[in-house]
């Protein structure tokens, strides 16, 4: 399908002008290539009428032009002095007329209505209000005032000053007679319907001295605003319906093939399941306007959208509406990234979030979509360093890999973390994307002890087991903070034969803190990555306590029974001074080492990567 998009149907009246806007993907080639407007002939050929290279056909001379707006990816064709002969089928396009990078436009020019002399024309959008002004002479001031609608050769009474109201206008029409001295009465019709369209006659008095005034009421369906957005991107519909409906329920609906309108979202809590996780109805401003944001755009989101107000929260005739025609460009600048990321309970996910690469300095945000009421998305983390309290130690936003992608890591997953999350920046709002996190059955691949208590001044060694499938990945330990996860110096000795062959079920990368200081308290992550692309992580909290009077004792990790001075921590993790050991029944291969003395030549924090059979009773 062509990525060029424009209005499918354009209608106007003889003598008037039209302005036709066509959209194209603003790639470098497209921005500079020829733009054209051509008319389709009976043979199927399309004859150029105007182009961006300055050509204007003789038929269009002096009344048409084409302007390209390369920065927006749009061009506009203006045609003036329309005649009935201009009705027909046209194409706006790029390159060569026959190449297919084009959009079909139907133009219909109709004859203007033959109106009686002195007819006042009122042009109003459907759902809005019109005030028809009816002048009269002094002698008709005390006489009956009325408004009729002309239907064919007959006139049907709509309203009069004797309190008659035509049933078709019940509860939405009023006749106002001003005070003495003002020789004009007005008829106000609210919530205009398409059927109200037509010629009206104001009348004051009767007989030959009566005052009459003709009024032509043109009720228009709102011209849909063309919206051109990228696949996987985001669109915002701004809906301004006026103060008169400020306190009425609002909705956004999509026109279906039966020409009815299916509610997408409304303020009464209804939401189409196809938009679950990717829509917000923003609260209305003082002027009654509101907006709807849809992220993760799909091709099937294309179509005609209407926003409106009605107490039922859905489209009803005679209530104000606004319209959009959404086109979703498949030649998207927004890169593909997984829309669903799966993790296991206790494990982690690394989510890649795209952003506009031209905005590398923009602030990055990650929020959790909630479906309650009109939808909301509370902030969880942002790139300046704010992490919400309940996510401390398990959530980090990283600028890597950069160049249009940032990474969000969430670990210590529980079933409550399942849901929809939004990636966004304070820059280009069209780059908002949605990702769904699903929690599936399984075990975390990285295994670390539970909470660890380290003793001030001593050495702490924390193991992290990884499976063979990660043997080619880079392993790291880092200390978590609000601003990210600071990688700790590594003492990777390189792969041994066993490491290369990966003939063991599990491998080990250890973190050594030597000597332990107060500043070491906090969250530590063990993780794997490939270049700037992050994989799984596992988190462990290190608490730091004063040295006890009694010296440290080494307790074999294989010892299943609790030692006398052991205290039980959470789920199978026990602590012996600063030796954290997992219950061997849960974690048979765990080796945790606590040395009382300093390591000769050892750094204060180091990471040691080795196979588990090489890991001895002290760190290397």
């Amino acid at each position: 399908k062509s990525p060029v998009f424009g209005p499918q149907e354009v209608s106007s009246v003889e003598g008037n002008s039209v302005s036709i806007k066509c959209y194209y993907p603003p790639t470098s080639v497209n921005r500079h290539t020829r733009k054209y407007w051509c008319r389709k002939g009976a043979s199927g050929r399309c004859i150029t009428l105007v182009s961006s290279e300055g050509y204007v056909s003789s038929n269009y001379a002096g009344r048409a032009n084409l302007t390209n707006f390369p920065e927006n990816g749009t061009f506009v064709v203006n045609i003036a002095q329309l005649s009935r002969d201009d009705s027909g089928h046209y194409k706006c396009g790029l390159g060569i007329n026959s190449r297919g990078l084009s959009f079909d436009v139907s133009l219909e020019v109709s004859q203007g209505p033959e109106l009686p002399n002195g007819t006042e024309v009122y042009t109003v959008d459907v759902g809005r209000t019109v005030t028809i002004k009816c002048p009269f002479k002094t002698e008709n001031a005390p006489k009956t005032k009325a408004l009729y609608k002309k239907i064919g050769q007959t006139s049907v009474l709509v309203i009069d000053s004797r309190n008659y109201v035509n049933p078709n206008y019940k509860d939405r029409i009023r006749l106002r007679i001003p005070g003495t001295g003002q020789l004009i009465f007005t008829v106000v019709i609210d919530r205009l319907r398409l059927s109200d369209h037509g010629l009206y006659l104001c009348q004051a008095g009767d007989g030959s001295n009566r005052d009459e005034k003709n009024a032509d009421l043109q009720v228009l369906e709102p011209e849909p605003e063309l919206v051109y957005e990228d696949l996987r991107g985001s669109v915002t519909f701004h809906c301004a319906l006026g103060l008169e409906v400020a306190n009425v329920a609002k909705f956004l609906c999509r026109v279906n093939s039966r020409e009815t309108c299916d509610v997408v979202i409304n303020t009464l809590g209804k939401r189409d399941s196809a938009f679950e996780g990717r829509i917000l109805l923003n609260p209305q401003d003082k002027d009654g306007s509101f907006s709807v944001v849809i992220t993760g755009l799909r091709k099937e989101d294309e179509g005609r959208y209407l926003c409106g107000a009605h107490s039922d929260g859905q489209l009803q005739e005679g209530w104000p509406i606004q319209a959009w025609q959404l086109f979703v460009n498949e030649e998207s600048t927004i890169p593909r990234s997984p829309t669903v990321v799966k993790g296991v309970a206790g494990g982690s996910v690394a989510v890649l979030c795209p952003y506009n690469p031209k905005e590398s300095q923009s602030l990055k945000y990650w929020c959790l979509w909630e479906g309650a009421q009109n939808g909301r998305c509370p902030l969880l983390v942002e790139s300046q360093g704010l992490v919400q309290e309940q996510y401390e130690g398990r959530l980090s936003l990283l600028q890597e890999p950069g160049n249009g992608t940032f990474t969000v890591i969430l670990n210590q997953l529980t079933t409550q973390d399942a849901g929809f999350y939004w990636c966004l920046t304070n820059g280009d709002t069209r780059w908002r994307t949605t990702v769904e996190i699903k929690i599936i059955e399984g075990e975390p691949n990285l295994k670390v002890p539970g909470n660890v208590t380290a003793v001030l001044g001593e050495t702490l060694n924390i193991p992290c087991h990884f499976p063979c499938k990660f043997s080619s990945y880079e392993k790291y330990w880092c200390k978590w903070s609000n601003t990210g996860c600071q990688t700790l110096p590594s003492q990777d000795e390189g792969p041994s034969e066993a490491f290369v062959n990966c003939d063991e079920n599990s491998r080990l990368v250890s973190l050594t803190l030597n000597p332990v200081t107060r500043a070491d308290e906090g969250w530590y992550w063990c993780g794997v990555k490939q270049g700037h692309f992050y994989g799984e992580t596992a988190a462990v909290y290190v608490a730091v306590e004063e040295k006890k009077v009694a010296g440290s004792r080494y307790v074999s990790p294989a010892k299943a029974d609790a030692a006398p001075d052991e205290k039980v921590l959470d789920s199978g993790v026990r602590e012996i001074e600063n030796k954290a050991i997992q219950d061997p029944r849960l974690f048979a291969e765990e080796k945790v080492v606590a040395d009382t003395g300093d390591q000769a030549g050892g750094s204060r924090a180091s990471v040691d990567s080795s196979s588990s059979e090489e890991q001895g009773g002290s760190s290397k």
Epitope: V293, E382, Q384
Partner: nanobody
């Protein structure tokens, strides 16, 4: 709508001190980030220091050890205590507040009018 009012700017001697204060008013539920930025003629605004809703504080390198950010109990007032002032600290200082809108899924940013700090050598 949120209004930010700064006070405390003025003239200080090199090596001296000044205290800037910023108070946010209006319809505020929770301010996620409050910060001080500064701007000298012909240059862009640059961050000086900021404090998050969870009380984590950041300082740019040039402010570390000399400037201190503190916040009132109600979390809607933030003070910047500037000690050991240097001529390079002379600038217009702007208060900044960032408030995340759950409903809109966006961070709304507000700025004060700015207060002038002059440092004489």
């Amino acid at each position: 709508e949120v209004q930010l009012v700064e006070s405390g700017g003025g003239l200080a001697q090199a090596g001296g001190s000044l205290r800037l204060s910023c108070t946010a008013s209006g319809t505020i539920s929770k301010i996620d980030v409050m910060a001080w930025y500064r701007q000298t003629p012909g240059n862009e605004r640059e961050l000086v220091a900021r404090i998050f809703s969870n009380d984590v504080t950041h300082y740019v390198d040039s402010a570390k050890g000399r400037f201190t950010l503190s916040r009132a109990q109600d979390k809607n007032t933030v003070d910047l205590q500037m000690n050991s002032l240097e001529p390079d600290d002379a600038a217009v200082y702007y208060c900044n507040a960032q408030i995340w809108s759950d409903m809109r899924g966006r961070m709304d940013t507000y700025w004060g009018q700015g207060t002038l700090v002059t440092v004489s050598s």
